[in-house]
Every structure is written in C-alpha cells, then in structure tokens.
C-alpha cells in the first residue's frame, strides 16, 4: 500500500491527481481560509512533505451539479 512517507512531485503528482480526481480536474492550490491568509498548495503538501489520499482528494475540482 501507499506509504505516507513517500512524496509526489512533478509528473508523478499530476498523474496521481488525475487518478484520484478523474478527468474533472484539480487545483494546485486551495482558496485560503479566513484562519490562514496563505494557502499552502499541493506541491508544498505532497512534494516537499508526504501526503495521503484524503489530502489529495481535497485538491479535486468540484464536480458540476447533478441535473
């Protein structure tokens, strides 16, 4: 299984996001919250340190609304 100690960078990170999110797309940074004025971004969270599936999923684009 995926070990959270591993990091994901470059093409490997992009391919992994496509696998996790499907073709709906993903963001490299999330909107900053009111608590933290600065959004970290997925490169900082998954390339400079380790991340897991749950964290990767937070960068997926929001699917279009159901009809």
């Amino acid at each position: 299984a995926y070990r959270p100690s591993e990091t994901l960078c470059g093409g490997e990170l992009v391919d992994t996001l496509q696998f996790v999110c499907g073709d709906r797309g993903f963001y490299f940074s999330r909107p900053a919250s009111r608590v933290s004025r600065r959004s970290r971004g997925i490169v900082e969270e998954c390339c400079f340190r380790s991340c897991d599936l749950a964290l990767l999923e937070t960068y997926c684009a929001t699917p279009a609304k159901s009809e």
Epitope: F19, C21, D23, L53, K65
Partner: antibody
Framework: QVQLQQLGAEVKMPGSSVKVSCKAS????????ISWVRQAPGQGLEWMGG????????KYAQKFQGRVTITADKSTSTAYMELSSLGSEDTAVYYC?????????????WGQGTLVTVSS | DIQMTQSPSSLSASVGDRVTIVCRAS??????VNWYQQKPGKAPKLLIY???SLQSGVSSRFSGSGSGTEFALTISSLQPEDFATYFC?????????FGQGTRLEIK
C-alpha cells in the same frame, strides 16, 4: 504493448474470500494504472477500484469499500484484487483493465477475465 | 455517483446500415465519455475516448459525438464483425460508471 494476463476460473464458498491476480508482461508496468471491473452473467460492467502500481495509491468504489483490497507487487509486475465475504451476487467475471498514467480510466488494455463462481 | 443511461438496450440492424447509440449522463461531464465494444466471452475493447477521439487501430466507421450530458456512438456502415454489445463509460469523476449496454443484433 503491455499484456495483462489473468487466471481462468475460481470456485468459492459463500462467506469466503477470493484473490484474483493480473500479471503484466511485454511492457512497462509503471506506465499504467490498473483498475478492476466486474461483470455478472449477462449484466453490465461495474468498476470496483484501481491502483497506481508503482506508488500503491488505491481508489475504491464506495460500494466495495471495506470488502475489497487492491494491491500490486512491483517486483513481479502483478496486481491483485481480493474480495471478502463472498455471496452469490459476487458470481461474475473479474477483469483487470489498464489505462495509461495520466489517462487512468481510458481502459485500452484488458485481461481476459477470471470467472469467480460463488456456490455451496 | 454519476449514472449513465444508454438507449436503446437492444437494436436490430442489417449489414450496411448506419446506427446510432445514445448515452445520457445524470450530470454534466464535459466530454469525458468512452465507448467500448464487447463480444461474447471476450473483454471489452476501447473504441472511442474523450467523446470523439478514435482509439488507435479502430475502424473509422466508428465515430463519437456529444458533450455535457448527451453522447452518441455512430457506426456509419455496419459490418458483420460489428454485431456485439456496446457500453459507454464516464471518466469525469470516480467512481467510474458504465451504461447498461446496447446489444446490436443482426436483423
């Protein structure tokens, strides 16, 4: 071109588990994401989940979460799908399907399927 | 989950006919639909990806169209080897889902 090879058939008792294998040959295992798709007799296709073998990152369909485990062994270029608590409704052909990394779900490569029959 | 609804569920046609199979998604999915052909006892085969791109090695008599929620697979002139079951698939958002299939039979 990667070829995905599966074993022919398994017969299992209700309540037991089955582990189906999918061996890649003739290409680069690392360039693919592997999904597992099942097809009950005369029915449609159902995606169970998938894995990026080189990273071990796994995504499951909610329906199977907790009952299915997908793994991969990089050293033998083999992916596995284990399904537990089998019932008669799990009788199906189980396919492994490969999609190129970055296009994980464009299944351009399929194993020949493993028929799993659940019967007492 | 995104539901994919195919119609018709079965279709009878003759060699040389032009046939169209339709697939509707329960929500807008841009152009992220694939089409597969499956023959009895065999694994599915990818024909069309991203709604309209022809997979390498697939005959040009197969074509795909559509975007949003409505998609179509057209076979311009049916050949004997085209009688099979066809499935649509959405890749927009996991869990990946398929249509229930359209069985194309010889009239």
């Amino acid at each position: 071109q990667v070829q995905l090879q599966q074993l022919g058939a398994e017969v299992k008792m209700p309540g037991s588990s089955v582990k189906v294998s999918c061996k890649a040959s003739g290409g680069t295992f690392s360039s693919y994401a592997i999904s597992w798709v099942r097809q009950a007799p005369g029915q449609g296709l159902e995606w169970m989940g998938g894995i990026i073998p080189t990273l071990g990152i796994v995504k499951y369909a909610q329906k199977f979460q907790g009952r299915v485990t997908i793994t991969a062994d990089k050293s033998t270029s083999t992916a596995y799908m284990e399904l537990s608590s089998l019932g008669s409704e799990d009788t199906a052909v189980y396919y492994c399907a490969g999609g190129p990394r970055g296009y994980s779900y464009n299944f351009d490569n399929w194993g020949q399927g493993t028929l799993v029959t659940v019967s007492s | 989950d995104i539901q994919m609804t195919q119609s018709p569920s079965s279709l009878s046609a003759s060699v040389g006919d032009r046939v169209t199979i339709v697939c509707r998604a329960s929500q807008t999915i841009s152009r992220y639909v694939n089409w597969y052909q499956q023959k009895p006892g065999k694994a599915p085969k990818l024909l069309i990806y991203a709604a309209s791109s022809l997979q390498s090695g697939v005959s040009s008599r197969f074509s795909g169209s559509g975007s949003g929620t409505e998609f179509a697979l057209t076979i311009s002139s049916l050949q004997p080897e085209d009688f099979a079951t066809y499935f649509c698939q959405q890749t927009y958002s996991p869990p990946i889902t398929f249509g229930q299939g359209t069985r194309l039979e010889i009239k």
